[in-house]
Amino acid sequence: KKVVLGKKGDTVELTCTASQKKSIQFHWKNSNQIKILGNQGSFLTKGPSKLNDRADSRRSLWDQGNFPLIIKNLKIEDSDTYICEVEDQKEEVQLLVFGLTANSDTHLLQGQSLTLTLESPPGSSPSVQCRSPRGKNIQGGKTLSVSQLELQDSGTWTCTVLQNQKKVEFKIDIVVLAFQKASSIVYKKEGEQVEFSFPLAFTVEKLTGSGELWWQAERASSSKSWITFDLKNKEVSVKRVTQDPKLQMGKKLPLHLTLPQALPQYAGSGNLTLALEAKTGKLHQEVNLVVMRATQLQKNLTCEVWGPTSPKLMLSLKLENKEAKVSKREKAVWVLNPEAGMWQCLLSDSGQVLLESNIKVLPTWSTPVQP
């Protein structure tokens, strides 16, 4: 018996071939011997089966001795043994229809779980293997679960159902709702304007929700809400903003915040959350601000950084075009009795400069100038 696998909602064509290459009488029946369709001369006739409005054949092939049964918009319950009667012969074809669906919406928040459920006919014992867009393979039976979805899981999932050494492939498009970056860090000199950007990693027609930026300053004992906002059809409107600092927010996507001045008291970490309409859970992006200050007080030239720097970073003080006078894994370094000239304070990672601030040290009888 020939086995054919079909996909729920698809169309399947079951073949039936006569030895004579001409139009002769044929009938397609199901396992209960109920006629599905057949022919009378050159006319297609249909029986009383449940497939009535979904069954068809190709009259153009009859003259070549081919009498296919076409079933449209397949249902799981169409799984059956179909019998083609032609030239006193019976050809049996077993059709097995499978369906694969995502548990809920195919738009899921980062960190949520995706469950794929296989619908299969009674008596079948299929195995399923799914390949994620990032190439991860997941195997299972009737259900497949992927916990903690990541941004890279966005895209087309390809799932292969295997039964009787035959396979059928399903493609499911999954959209993981997330920010493009889970975390970002901004390095600024004291006094510079700071731009924070929170681009989304997905596009949807209408985007509605509300958001808030909580900030934990390094110098503060507790975090505070810096700004709350609403999002209506991709338009941003500020609901509430602190007086210090007075953040400004762009009116369009991507979400964009401006801090007028980088100051040591603002250095720290923030968490922007975005709650989307009709979605449980929130999107998160961490943002970090590191602020640098170079100062000269009497005979002491000091370079300091505030904020979440990593213990890998080097802080250096050097006279322009000379070797570093001091270079340490610290958040503050200093030079006593610095010689006159342009000094550079550098925050670097394996030689790559992340942040630089210059300070001019004048001969001892005059005061320093900050460019």
């Epitope: 894994r329 958040k331 670097s348 394996s350 030689g351």
Partner: antibody, heavy 129, light 113 residues
């Protein structure tokens, strides 16, 4: 398996240059720094410099400044150390070593530094007239 | 540059006995900002590259036997091998990575008595 494979032994004349390669395999090449350390016969270890394969940024010991150049080729996961104006005291075994650093910002959970945890087999450079 | 000085230069210890190697830095390698001692210990056997034993002055690298331990803070550090095994015969180096340039101690040769 994580490893660094270095180029073969070299014999050079004083004044010449030598270029030693260090190919990484089984290592996420751009995420970790590569140090160069040398060891003269019967002597201790001497740090020459560091390169970040991701951006190509470098930091050299002052002793080698102007004579050493560290470069990388991300397409082949290889870093190079070129030492010019060779003299007899440059005769040594030259090692590349992966300096592994893991962990986020200091505000986040633990910052883990793993030192120079993977070393190349060493390349012997002999400088002789 | 930070100068690292090890003592003794060589050491002979009986199998199963404790071996202690000291390392002194010319300035503190304890970062007050990150509260970490930027000090590592390496083991080098003849004809082989060095092998990382300890980082952050006291954290054992993965796969390093627990007979090796590191201690100390600021400028004074110690590597201890609680019960010497034959395979521990090697030269041991301390190294600071607090400041560029990184610097190594001159090495301590450990032998079996």
């Amino acid at each position: 398996q994580v490893q660094l494979v270095q180029s073969g032994a070299e014999v050079k004349k004083p004044g010449a240059s030598v270029k030693v390669s260090c190919k990484a395999s089984g290592i996420p090449f751009t995420s970790d720094d590569i140090n160069w350390v040398r060891q003269a016969p019967g002597q201790g270890l001497e740090w020459m410099g560091i390169i970040n394969p991701s951006g190509g940024s470098t930091s050299y010991a002052q002793k080698f400044q102007g004579r050493v150049t560290m470069t990388r080729d991300t397409s082949t996961s290889t870093v190079y150390m070129e030492l010019s104006s060779l003299r007899s005291e440059d005769t040594a075994v030259y090692y590349c070593a992966r300096e592994r650093y893991e962990g986020g910002y200091s505000s986040g959970p633990g910052n883990y530094y793993y030192g120079m945890d993977v070393w190349g087999q060493g390349t012997t450079v002999t400088v002789s007239s | 540059d930070i100068v690292m000085t090890q003592s003794p230069d060589s050491l002979a210890v009986s199998l199963g006995e404790r071996a202690t190697i000291n390392c002194k830095s010319s300035q503190s390698v304890l970062s007050s900002s990150y509260n970490k001692n930027y000090l590592a210990w390496y083991q080098q056997k003849p004809g082989q590259p060095p092998k990382l034993l300890i980082y952050w002055a006291s954290t054992r690298d993965s796969g390093v036997p627990d007979r090796f331990s590191g201690s100390g803070s600021g400028t004074d550090f110690t590597l201890t091998i609680s019960s010497l095994q034959a395979e521990d015969v090697a030269v041991y180096y301390c190294q600071q990575y607090y400041s560029i340039p990184y610097t190594f101690g001159q090495g301590t040769k450990l032998e079996i008595k």
